[in-house]
Interface confidence: low
């Protein structure tokens, strides 16, 4: 499975979206976890409603919300004010029973702010948001626009 | 002007280590992520990997996993990829990269020859 | 991994004429696709990011199109600094990969 390379400004908001087949996962919670270590266990850190009907409903822990589009089969996780200490290796994963699948393995970096560095104009933020397979990030800045980037390069 | 200095260049013999550093200079070290491609004699260019100036992290492609590491130094806006367990194939020229619209901003490149 | 393929792998043409390079990816790179263009002993140069957007200082007679797997870069009317070879890159999904590169020489 790929892992997707996602960036991120400190203090603004990161949206993953991860996408999947909404027949095979019909009936299934979902969830964010985040991984210890490259061969540790992953960590739960939100996982959508308990009532599989529910699911488009917010779930919130802390600053990190998700929630999920069953028949679009999308499950979208928002870490909000993004901090340094959120950089890692994180999972979209589906359950069944105590089983969990892995749908993405998303690396979050996390940038400092360029908005007010000169040089600010080189770093790679298209002004329309543009979707691709497995994951996407979008950036809102405090300028109030919503801006997106794809994995790093 | 953005700029990056990469180390001149180095022989080594097979089995060796080479350690290959890329000084930043014109924006903020820590805003950008680095690449490390590479290109043999007459042969097309190969990503190496990336690393996070800002937090350290790194993610390498998988032919040079195990043998590559990257490293940073913030106070001198320096990276840093070191290269082990050299064959001849290894033969090539090393180049650091900076990500803007894509890599945007390259080193002048380092070559590496690796000879008995 | 992505493997993109470029063809032809030589193309022979005379200044002022059009020059059409081909890369195709193995699987879908949205528009996540780059033009490099590079001379002996020189590092690689961005053309083109994004598929289709021309890098900062790039003249107009380079362009590109495509997107998914089928991409394509154009220089409409070849001047003599632009007999070089040309990568195409894609950054969708790691690992980063480049095309095997299409040498563009004076016939």
């Known amino acids: 499975l790929n892992t997707t390379v996602l960036q991120g400004m400190a203090g603004q908001s990161l949206r993953v979206s991860c996408t999947y087949d909404a027949l095979k996962h019909w009936g299934r919670r979902k969830a964010w976890c985040r991984q210890l270590g490259e061969e540790g266990p992953c960590q739960r850190v939100v996982s959508t409603h308990g009532v599989w009907l529910l699911a488009f409903l917010k779930k919130r822990n802390g600053s990190t919300v998700i929630a999920d589009d069953t028949l679009a089969g999308t499950v979208t996780i928002t870490l909000k004010n993004l901090q340094a200490g959120d950089a890692g290796l994180y999972q979209c994963q589906s359950l069944r029973g105590r089983e969990a699948e892995v749908l993405q393995k998303v690396l979050v970096e996390v940038l400092e702010d360029p908005l007010d560095d000169q040089d600010a104009g080189d770093l790679w933020v298209p002004e329309e948001s543009s979707s691709f397979e497995g994951a996407q990030v979008e950036h809102s800045t405090s300028r109030n626009q919503e801006t997106s980037f794809p994995p790093t390069s | 002007q953005v700029q990056l200095v990469q180390s001149g260049a180095e022989v080594k013999k097979p089995g060796a280590s080479v350690k290959v550093s890329c000084k930043a200079s014109g924006y903020t070290f820590t805003s950008y992520y680095m690449h490390w491609v590479r290109q043999a004699p007459g042969q097309g260019l190969e990503w190496m990997g990336i690393?996070?100036?800002?937090?350290?992290?790194?993610t390498y492609a998988q032919k040079f996993q195990g043998r590559v590491t990257m490293t940073r130094d913030t106070s001198t806006s320096t990276v840093y990829m070191e290269l082990s367990s050299l064959r001849s194939e290894d033969t090539a020229v090393y180049y650091c990269?900076?990500?803007?619209?894509?890599?945007?901003?390259w080193g002048q490149g380092t070559t590496v020859t690796v000879s008995s | 991994e992505i493997v993109l393929t470029q063809s032809p792998a030589t193309l022979s043409l005379s200044p002022g004429e059009r020059a059409t390079l081909s890369c195709r990816a193995s699987?879908?790179?949205?528009?996540?696709l780059a033009w490099y263009q590079q001379k002996p002993g020189q590092a690689p140069r961005l053309l083109i990011y994004d598929a289709s957007n021309r890098a900062t200082g790039i003249p107009a007679r380079f362009s590109g199109s495509g997107s998914g797997t089928d991409f394509t870069l154009t220089i409409s009317s070849l001047e003599p600094e632009d007999f070089a070879v040309y990568y195409c890159q894609q950054r969708s999904h790691f690992p980063i990969t480049f095309g095997g590169g299409t040498k563009v020489e004076i016939k």
């Open positions: 699987q879908s790179v949205s528009s996540y």
């Open positions: 990269a900076r990500p803007g619209k894509s890599m945007d901003v």
């Open positions: 690393i996070n100036p800002s937090g350290g992290s790194t």
